[in-house]
Interface confidence: medium
């Protein structure tokens, strides 16, 4: 009977040992499978994230295009209306002009003497820019960069006057220190009768026949 018990115990031990090995193998296999599944899940997750990012970007891009289209359509319809009305009323800026605070501005990329620049603006139903505030000055500087640029201010006919009749004496002024000085030490004949933005944005008077860049301005009519 003892020997039978011994045999049964040995058999149980063997079975238990086999079971342990088998269980370990299964745990290992499951662990490997788990890692594989985890990797696959991460892959799927990153693919989904990329797709979502792409979709978001596409959506943003589409929104921009739609906004631009709406703006273009509005601009075109406004241009058409202005064209039909012989340009007598303007409620939007011409193409390539920049709108700011109820005015349209055009920034030249070439250079001309003051008088020629003034004529150019007049042919565009505009005038050389009239600077009436610090905000407008800052806006213009952002768009111009540090370049000598004519403005619609001159004393060719006596006192300093803005080309659109804006009062000079009581209005905004942004001269460089000790300017205007009507300097004639340049030996070019006469003094300096036309105002321009200098490289730092402040104003200087200069010989009107110098070729500088220029800015045209035209007021927008209030839309009904």
């Amino acid at each position: 009977q003892n020997s039978q018990l011994r045999e049964d115990l040995l058999a149980l031990r063997q079975n238990f040992s086999n079971l342990t090995v088998s269980t370990e193998d299964q745990v290992k296999a499951l662990s490997t499978q788990g890692s594989s599944v985890g990797r696959k899940m991460k892959l799927v997750e990153s693919k989904l994230e990329k797709q979502q990012k792409d979709l978001t970007e596409d959506h943003s891009s589409l929104l921009l295009h739609v906004k631009q289209l709406v703006s273009d359509v509005r601009s075109l319809s406004c241009q058409m209306a202005a064209f039909r009305g012989n340009g007598s009323e303007r409620t939007c800026c011409p193409i390539n002009w920049v709108e700011y605070e109820g005015s349209c501005y055009w920034f030249s990329s070439s250079v001309r003497p003051w008088t020629e620049a003034d004529k150019y603006c007049q042919l565009e139903n505009a005038h050389l820019v009239v600077v009436t505030s610090r905000d407008e000055q800052n806006f213009l500087q952002r768009h111009m960069g540090p370049l000598n640029t004519w403005i619609g201010l001159t004393d060719q006919n006596g006192p300093w006057k803005w080309v659109d009749g804006t009062d000079y004496e009581t209005g905004f002024q942004n001269w460089r220190p000790e300017q205007p000085d009507n300097w004639y030490g340049h030996g070019l004949g006469g003094g300096e009768d036309c105002a321009h933005f200098t490289t730092d944005g402040r104003w200087n008077d200069d010989v009107c026949r110098r070729p500088y860049r220029w800015v045209c301005e035209t007021k927008l009519d209030k839309a009904n």
């Epitope: 000790e178 000085d181 300097w183 004639y184 340049h186």
Partner: nanobody, 116 residues
Framework: EVQLLESGGGLVQPGGSLRLSCAAS????????MIWVRQAPGKGLEWVSG????????YYADSVKGRFTISRDNSKNTLYLQMNSLRAEDAAVYYC?????????WGQGTLVTVSS
Amino acid sequence: EVQLLESGGGLVQPGGSLRLSCAASGFTFETQPMIWVRQAPGKGLEWVSGIEGDGGRTYYADSVKGRFTISRDNSKNTLYLQMNSLRAEDAAVYYCAKSGSSFDYWGQGTLVTVSS
């Protein structure tokens, strides 16, 4: 108070060189265009050369073009006139001026004599 003080004049032989200086004080020198003018004995004032505040542009009377060079050092508040190939007709009292619509501030001048 605005002050301009010229120096560097003297006696020089024809074909020689001189460098005039003008020390400025009492105003914002770097923003101010400056000029050199001269007055020969018994003659009126003659504009010689001009320079803008930043030194970027210079101007010369035809009579001195190619021989004289105007320059400035804004860090030293000083204006210069380098005069080469001097001629008898360049003899004069040279003044630097802070110029506006009229030459409102002058130095006392420095005498340049050209003689062999």
